[in-house]
C-alpha cells in the first residue's frame, strides 16, 4: 500500500485515480469501513466519520478520473489506512501524521535548553534529524535536546522525520534571547563623557521586563547598584538611580546609559541584567570602563590607567613624534624631568592604540 506522511495542522491530499477519464462514482472510507466522502452524480456527499468537517475533494478533477481526499488541519489521530473505492477497485493509502513541537516557548534565554518533541502515531518508528541555523546536526527519536543554546542558534531549525523511506520536513523558528555582545569595554580619558550601549540580539513586538546595572569599581571593596529600570512595550523607565555618578538612561531601545564624565573612581566593571516577563532566568551583559589620566606634578610626568586591563596591554609615555620614553605592561608609567613639549600617553594592544591622552609640558626657566 502507498504511504503518505503528513504534518499536524497541515493539509494533505490523498490521490485516487480511475482508468476512465470521466466522473464516476467513488467513495473514501477509513480502516473501519466508515464512509468519509463520495459523490452522487456531481454532488459531494459526506459520511459520519470524525473527519466530516475537515474532509473535502476537488470536484474540478472528477471529470479527469481523479477523486482526491483532502484532509485539512491534520491531527495525529487522523493516521489511518484510507480506502478509495472506484470502478470495483480499492486503492489503499496509509496516512501517518507527525507533529514536532518545542516543548517550551520558542523564545529561549541564552544558555537554556531546547527540547523538541515528536508526536507520532502508534506503531510508527520514525527517526528525526534536525539542523540548527549554524549547521549543527542533532539526531534522535521521540525527543531531541540541545543544551546551552547560543546566539547563533537563533533562526529556523529544519527537522526531517523519516518513516518507511518517506520524509516530512518541519521548520521551527527559535529565538535566542540575548544581548548582541556578552561583554564590552569602553576606554576613556578622564573627564570624557561615557556611553554604554546594550543592544539586544532579537526583536519582538512587545518587550516587557525589568533590569539593573550593578557596578564593581576597581577602587571599591564591594559592588553597588547604579540603576534599576522597567521595560514596558519597549519603553524604558528608570525606577531608581544612584546620585554618584549622575547617570542618564535613554527611554528607547537599545538600552543606553551615559555618564557625564569618566573618573578614576568609576573605572571598573558592571553587569547589566535584564529579566523578561514570563521568562525564567535573566539576560546578562558585562561592561568594562577603563579610565586614563595624565598628570604633571613638579618634575614628574605620570600616566595612569584604572579599570580592567589585560596584562598584555602596553602603557607608554612619549614625546610627540619621538620614540617612547617609557613603555611597560603596567597600570602606571612616569618620566622624571620631562622635556618641554606635547607628551602622549598611550594604552595599546599589539600596536593598536586603544586610548590616548595628551599633556603639554612647559619649559622650566
Amino acid at each position: 500500500k502507498k504511504v503518505v506522511l503528513g504534518k499536524k495542522g497541515d493539509t494533505v491530499e490523498l490521490t485516487c485515480t480511475a482508468s476512465q477519464k470521466k466522473s464516476i462514482q467513488f467513495h473514501w472510507k477509513n480502516s473501519n469501513q466508515i464512509k468519509i466522502l463520495g459523490n452522487q452524480g456531481s454532488f459531494l456527499t459526506k459520511g459520519p466519520s470524525k473527519l466530516n468537517d475537515r474532509a473535502d475533494s476537488r470536484r474540478s478533477l472528477w471529470d479527469q478520473g481523479n477523486f482526491p481526499l483532502i484532509i485539512k488541519n491534520l491531527k495525529i489521530e487522523d493516521s489511518d489506512t484510507y480506502i478509495c473505492e472506484v470502478e470495483d477497485q480499492k486503492e489503499e493509502v496509509q496516512l501517518l501524521v507527525f507533529g514536532l513541537t518545542a516543548n517550551s516557548d520558542t523564545h529561549l534565554l541564552q544558555g537554556q535548553s531546547l527540547t523538541l518533541t515528536l508526536e507520532s502515531p502508534p506503531g510508527s518508528s520514525p527517526s528525526v534529524q534536525c539542523r540548527s541555523p549554524r549547521g549543527k546536526n542533532i539526531q534522535g527519536g521521540k525527543t531531541l535536546s540541545v543544551s546551552q543554546l547560543e546566539l547563533q542558534d537563533s533562526g529556523t531549525w529544519t527537522c526531517t522525520v523519516l518513516q518507511n523511506q518517506k520524509k516530512v520536513e518541519f521548520k521551527i523558528d527559535i529565538v535566542v534571547l540575548a544581548f548582541q555582545k556578552a561583554s564590552s569595554i569602553v576606554y576613556k580619558k578622564e573627564g570624557e563623557q561615557v556611553e554604554f550601549s546594550f543592544p539586544l540580539a532579537f526583536t519582538v513586538e512587545k518587550l516587557t521586563g525589568s533590569g539593573e546595572l550593578w557596578w564593581q569599581a576597581e577602587r571599591a571593596s564591594s559592588s553597588k547598584s547604579w540603576i534599576t529600570f522597567d521595560l514596558k512595550n519597549k519603553e524604558v523607565s528608570v525606577k531608581w538611580v544612584t546620585q554618584d555618578p549622575k547617570l542618564q538612561m535613554g527611554k528607547k531601545l537599545p538600552l543606553h546609559l551615559t555618564l557625564p564624565q569618566a573618573l578614576p573612581q568609576y573605572a571598573g566593571s558592571g553587569n547589566l541584567t535584564l529579566a523578561l516577563e514570563a521568562k525564567t532566568g535573566k539576560l546578562h551583559q558585562e561592561v568594562n570602563l577603563v579610565v586614563m589620566r595624565a598628570t604633571q606634578l613638579q618634575k614628574n610626568l605620570t600616566c595612569e590607567v584604572w579599570g580592567p586591563t589585560s596584562p598584555k596591554l602596553m602603557l607608554s609615555l612619549k614625546l610627540e613624534n619621538k620614540e617612547a620614553k617609557v613603555s611597560k605592561r603596567e597600570k602606571a608609567v612616569w618620566v622624571l624631568n620631562p622635556e618641554a613639549g606635547m607628551w602622549q600617553c598611550l594604552l595599546s594592544d599589539s600596536g593598536q592604540v586603544l586610548l590616548e591622552s595628551n599633556i603639554k609640558v612647559l619649559p622650566t626657566w
Epitope: 512595550n233 538612561m249 535613554g250 527611554k251
Partner: antibody, heavy 119, light 107 residues
Framework: EVELLESGGGLVQPGGSLRLSCAAS????????MSWVRQAPGKGLEWVSG????????YYADSVKGRFTITSDNSKNTLYLQMNSLRAEDTAVYYC????????????WGKGTTVTVSS | AIQMTQSPSSLSASVGDRVTITCRAS??????LGWYQQKPGKAPKVLIS???SLQSGVPSRFSGSRSGTDFTLTISSLQPEDFATYYC?????????FGQGTKLEIK
C-alpha cells in the same frame, strides 16, 4: 489627518486649579506617547509633562512635579493636565503634542490654550 | 535633568545666507535630538528628528548633524519664510529639555 485640540485654559488666581484637555482625532490614542509643552509670554518652549501610550508611565518637569498630573482616557481619545497650586510663573500657552511611533519626535501639535495665573 | 545649551540666542542674516545653529547636551544623548521651527502665534513644527532625519515636506536646505554631544542645524540658503525661532529638543530621556531658542531675523 491627525488633529489635536486643547481646551480648558483661562484666568485663575494663584493657588487655584485648572484642568486642561486635549482631544485627539484621527489616531489610535493608546499607541502613542503624548506630552504637554508650554510657552510663557515672550519666552522659549518648556516641556511640562509626558505620558506613555499605555498610560502606565507619567513624567514631569521639576518645575511642576507634585502640582500637575497628566492622565489620558483612551476611550475618549483625550489627554488631560490637572494643574493645582498654580503660580504666576505657570502663565503660558499650553500645547499638547503627539509623539511619533517610536518616540522619535513630536510630530503633531495642537494650537494651544492660554492659562493666566493672576490675582 | 539633561541641559541643552543652544547658541546663538539670536541671529541676523540675509536671504541666501548659510546659517548654523548649535545645541550642546550636558550628557550623551545618542541621536535623540530634534529641531523645531516656531513662527509668532503658531505652534512649533518639527523639521528634523533623530539628529538628521528630515521630515516629509521640509525643504532639503535644512539639515542636521552631530559631533559627540554637539548638534547642529544648518540652513544652506536662507529663504524669506525661514525667519522664525528655532529650538532643539532632547528626547533621549525624561524630563525632555528644549534649548533656549534661536531667533533668526532679517538683517
Amino acid at each position: 489627518e491627525v488633529e489635536l485640540l486643547e481646551s480648558g485654559g483661562g484666568l485663575v488666581q494663584p493657588g487655584g486649579s485648572l484642568r486642561l484637555s486635549c482631544a485627539a482625532s484621527g489616531l489610535t490614542f493608546s499607541t502613542f506617547a503624548m506630552s504637554w509643552v508650554r510657552q510663557a509670554p515672550g519666552k522659549g518652549l518648556e516641556w511640562v509633562s509626558g505620558i506613555s501610550g499605555s498610560g502606565e508611565n507619567t513624567y514631569y518637569a521639576d518645575s511642576v512635579k507634585g502640582r500637575f498630573t497628566i492622565t489620558s482616557d483612551n476611550s475618549k481619545n483625550t489627554l488631560y493636565l490637572q494643574m493645582n497650586s498654580l503660580r504666576a510663573e505657570d502663565t503660558a500657552v499650553y500645547y499638547c503634542a503627539k509623539e511619533g511611533y517610536n518616540w522619535n519626535y513630536m510630530d503633531v501639535w495642537g494650537k494651544g490654550t492660554t492659562v493666566t495665573v493672576s490675582s | 535633568a539633561i541641559q541643552m545649551t543652544q547658541s546663538p540666542s539670536s541671529l541676523s542674516a540675509s536671504v541666501g545666507d548659510r546659517v548654523t545653529i548649535t545645541c550642546r547636551a550636558s550628557h550623551g544623548i545618542r541621536n535623540d535630538l530634534g529641531w523645531y521651527q516656531q513662527k509668532p502665534g503658531k505652534a512649533p513644527k518639527v523639521l528634523i528628528s533623530e539628529t538628521s532625519s528630515l521630515q516629509s515636506g521640509v525643504p532639503s536646505r535644512f539639515s542636521g548633524s552631530r559631533s559627540g554631544t554637539d548638534f547642529t542645524l544648518t540652513i544652506s540658503s536662507l529663504q524669506p519664510e525661514d525667519f522664525a525661532t528655532y529650538y532643539c529638543l532632547q528626547d533621549y530621556t525624561y524630563p525632555y529639555t528644549f534649548g533656549q531658542g534661536t531667533k533668526l531675523e532679517i538683517k
